[in-house]
Interface confidence: low
């Protein structure tokens, strides 16, 4: 039956604490200013409905659609036009023109203070207070920060988040076992959010298309004893699934992924051998599990490529009959035997293929025209496995902070109108890809490496959509979406750049960065040198590396001086002279 | 469970009219681009429309064009097929198929099909 009620529906699959934290998420992304008891305000309004529905599917209202109802409870906001300006707007409109509209004010920067930890005792002290509102809290600042976290996957950390104080709170060294554990999950939610925003930027920004391909490669590595067919399902439905989060809809999409990772686990034998410790999860970690399940091994003895998508007389003919179907079925045959590449590299060998064939097919001997297809592929390879080579070397050579710095110079010569808070971020970012991935042997590095730069690339594209002010970066952000990081690579420094003029107190530190942690202090520096090139982009390694030095020995020797304060007024001075003589300003 | 349900079809005489609907249970047809499909004793099964799941985009074989019409209620979780000047030669079993989002170019393309409904054109 079509069911009467889609929230009764939702409700009954997904349970009540599933369904008000799923609510919760959805308002809280939506509406990223409101405060946290105005939106459990709004979540238990909601359950109480759904729950009249359950009860009676033919009640008032319990048919509207699920836009429908989270729209007009959104829409009673009472400070919606002075919170949110033009996004008040959107209630004036029907869905399902509403919901874009809400979709459109997503804020991937969004003016919000930062998260400070408390001390332990505090949040162990609030946590057992009340553990319901604790844990809808750590749900709510994680949701309006990130407004395209992945919904279902912000259940599994939350369950991550509430055993880490149940276990801690408990322990006689309380801190040592919490931090860590805090740590972790803050940088795994990080990254969890920067890869669906990824996700989601492909299906709105290149369509369901760009998705599925990404999906069939994907899958097609990580199941490669699976048949087409099969990898063919679990693309439409995991499209299905990313579709619904990206598109706000948290409820069907968390519902959708539990089916998802219930067929999995039923078929795990026509999938996958990795999937067995998996499937013997609870729900949450099980589809955490199978998100990141290691790829199965290659089935032995695949034959050539060659043979039925070059030597083969019916080539074009298949093209024809289903131009999709059989790129897909290139995509998969190639992806399956190359673990070792990245998903955007499969991509673009697809694509160079799909251009040989659209024209190749239409020439007078297609078969002598697409015959040597296979050799186009090898500067594509080659180039994404030169350059981690590169930079795998320069990494090792320089640790993390100091290849973090050679980027920050790298990106802020290559586009320096972009922000420094953005370049700074982004830099950092990229600088990872070394200690997460040049440890890794030749043939996970490339997967690992180049995947990992579309992920934070795409953080780049989705900042700088928002203000845009330099043309290279949204050329790159929208030509192609898997030739990004090539496109990045390209740029050389922009010689229409008009230098910052100097301005001292960018250069002016204070006493209070003796406090700040590694990290931050980090931060601090690389903010100053973002700000230096930009002042003189056209300045050498050598000039910027000796300024850097000068800087860390002037915050080291401040640091230790009795009178913190006068150091850093007097030798910054000093520092700042000096620098401007070094670099000619 | 999810399923497709055919309904409307019958005997029709050349010249007349008649209105399939596919219901679909266990999903929502929101997201599901909708084809109708038929198939002739003997004959392979082939296209006939197909409406994306927005609406906004609709296609038809060159063989009914001007004479079917293909909608959607989603709100009631069906699709339509109007077929009006109805011809011997569109006497077949007709099937609706449903595939996330968009048309598919190919049969195999589509997730979910109906157990389908035969339509007879004839005098």
């Known amino acids: 039956d079509a069911h009467k009620s889609e929230v009764a529906h939702r409700f009954k699959d997904l349970g009540e604490e599933n369904f008000k934290a799923l609510v919760l998420i959805a308002f809280a992304q939506y509406l990223q200013q409101c405060p946290f008891e105005d939106h459990v305000k709004l979540v238990n309004e909601v359950t109480e409905f759904a729950k009249t529905c359950v009860a009676d599917e033919s009640a008032e209202n319990c048919d509207k659609s699920l836009h429908t109802l989270f729209g007009d409870k959104l829409c009673t906001v009472a400070t919606l036009r002075e919170t949110y300006g033009e996004m008040a707007d959107c209630c004036a409109k029907q869905e399902p023109e509403r919901n874009e509209c809400f979709l459109q004010h997503k804020d991937d920067n969004p003016n919000l203070p930062r998260l400070v930890r408390p001390e332990v005792d505090v949040m162990c002290t609030a946590f057992h207070d009340n553990e319901e509102t604790f844990l809808k809290k750590y749900l709510y600042e994680i949701a309006r920060r990130h407004p395209y976290f992945y919904a279902p996957e912000l259940l599994f950390f939350a369950k991550r988040y509430k055993a880490a104080f149940t276990e801690c709170c408990q322990a006689a060294d309380k801190a040592a076992c919490l931090l860590p554990k805090l740590d972790e999950l803050r940088d795994e939610g990080k990254a969890s959010s920067a890869k669906q925003r990824l996700k989601c930027a492909s299906l709105q920004k290149f369509g369901e298309r760009a998705f599925k391909a990404w999906a069939v490669a994907r899958l097609s590595q990580r199941f490669p004893k699976a048949e087409f067919a099969e990898v063919s399902k679990l693309v439409t439905d995991l499209t299905k699934v990313h579709t619904e989060c990206c598109h706000g809809d948290l409820l069907e999409c968390a519902d959708d992924r539990a089916d998802l990772a219930k067929y999995i686990c039923e078929n795990q034998d026509s999938i996958s051998s990795k999937l067995k410790e998996c499937c013997e999860k609870p729900l949450l970690e099980k589809s955490h599990c199978i998100a990141e399940v290691e790829n199965d091994e290659m089935p032995a003895d695949l034959p050539s490529l060659a043979a039925d998508f070059v030597e083969s007389k019916d080539v074009c003919k298949n093209y024809a009959e289903a131009k999709d179907v059989f790129l897909g079925m290139f995509l998969y045959e190639y992806a399956r035997r190359h673990p070792d590449y990245s998903v955007v590299l499969l991509l673009r060998l697809a694509k160079t293929y799909e251009t040989t064939l659209e024209k190749c097919c239409a020439a007078a001997d297609p078969h002598e025209c697409y015959a040597k297809v296979f050799d186009e592929f090898k500067p594509l390879v080659e180039e994404p496995q030169n350059l981690i080579k590169q930079n795998c070397e320069l990494f090792e050579q320089l640790g993390e902070y100091k290849f973090q710095n050679a980027l920050l110079v790298r990106y802020t010569k290559k586009v320096p109108q972009v922000s420094t808070p953005t370049l700074v971020e982004v830099s950092r970012n990229l600088g990872k890809v070394g200690s997460k991935c040049c440890k890794h042997p030749e043939a996970k590095r490339m997967p690992c490496a180049e995947d990992y730069l579309s992920v934070v690339l795409n953080q780049l594209c989705v900042l700088h959509e928002k203000t845009p002010v330099s043309d290279r970066v949204t050329k790159c952000c929208t030509e192609s979406l898997v030739n990004r990081r090539p496109c990045f690579s390209a740029l050389e420094v922009d010689e229409t750049y008009v230098p910052k003029e100097f301005n001292a107190e960018t250069f002016t530190f204070h006493a209070d960065i003796c406090t700040l942690s590694e990290k931050e202090r980090q931060i601090k520096k690389q903010t100053a040198l973002v700000e230096l090139v930009k002042h003189k982009p056209k300045a050498t390694k050598e000039q910027l590396k000796a300024v850097m030095d000068d800087f860390a020995a002037f915050v080291e020797k401040c640091c230790k001086a009795d009178d913190k304060e006068t150091c850093f007024a007097e030798e910054g001075k000093k520092l700042v002279a000096a620098s401007q003589a070094a670099l000619g300003l | 469970q999810v399923q497709l349900q055919e309904s409307g079809g019958g005997l029709v005489q050349p010249g007349g009219s008649l209105r399939l609907s596919c219901a679909a249970s266990?999903?929502?047809?929101?997201?599901?681009?909708i084809g109708w499909f038929r198939q002739a004793p003997g004959k392979e099964r082939e296209g006939v429309s197909c409406?994306?799941?927005?609406?906004?985009?609709?296609n038809y074989a060159d063989s009914v064009k001007g004479r079917f019409t293909i909608s959607r209620d989603n709100a009631k979780n069906t699709v339509y097929l109007q077929m009006n000047k109805l011809k011997p030669e569109d006497t077949a079993v007709y099937y609706c198929?449903?595939?996330?989002?968009?048309?598919?170019?190919?049969?195999?393309?589509?997730?979910?099909w109906g157990q389908g409904t035969q339509v007879t054109v004839s005098s």
């Open positions: 266990g999903f929502t047809l929101d997201y599901y681009a």
């Open positions: 198929a449903a595939a996330v989002l968009e048309c598919r170019t190919v049969v195999r393309g589509y997730d979910y």
């Open positions: 409406i994306a799941s927005s609406g906004g985009s609709t």
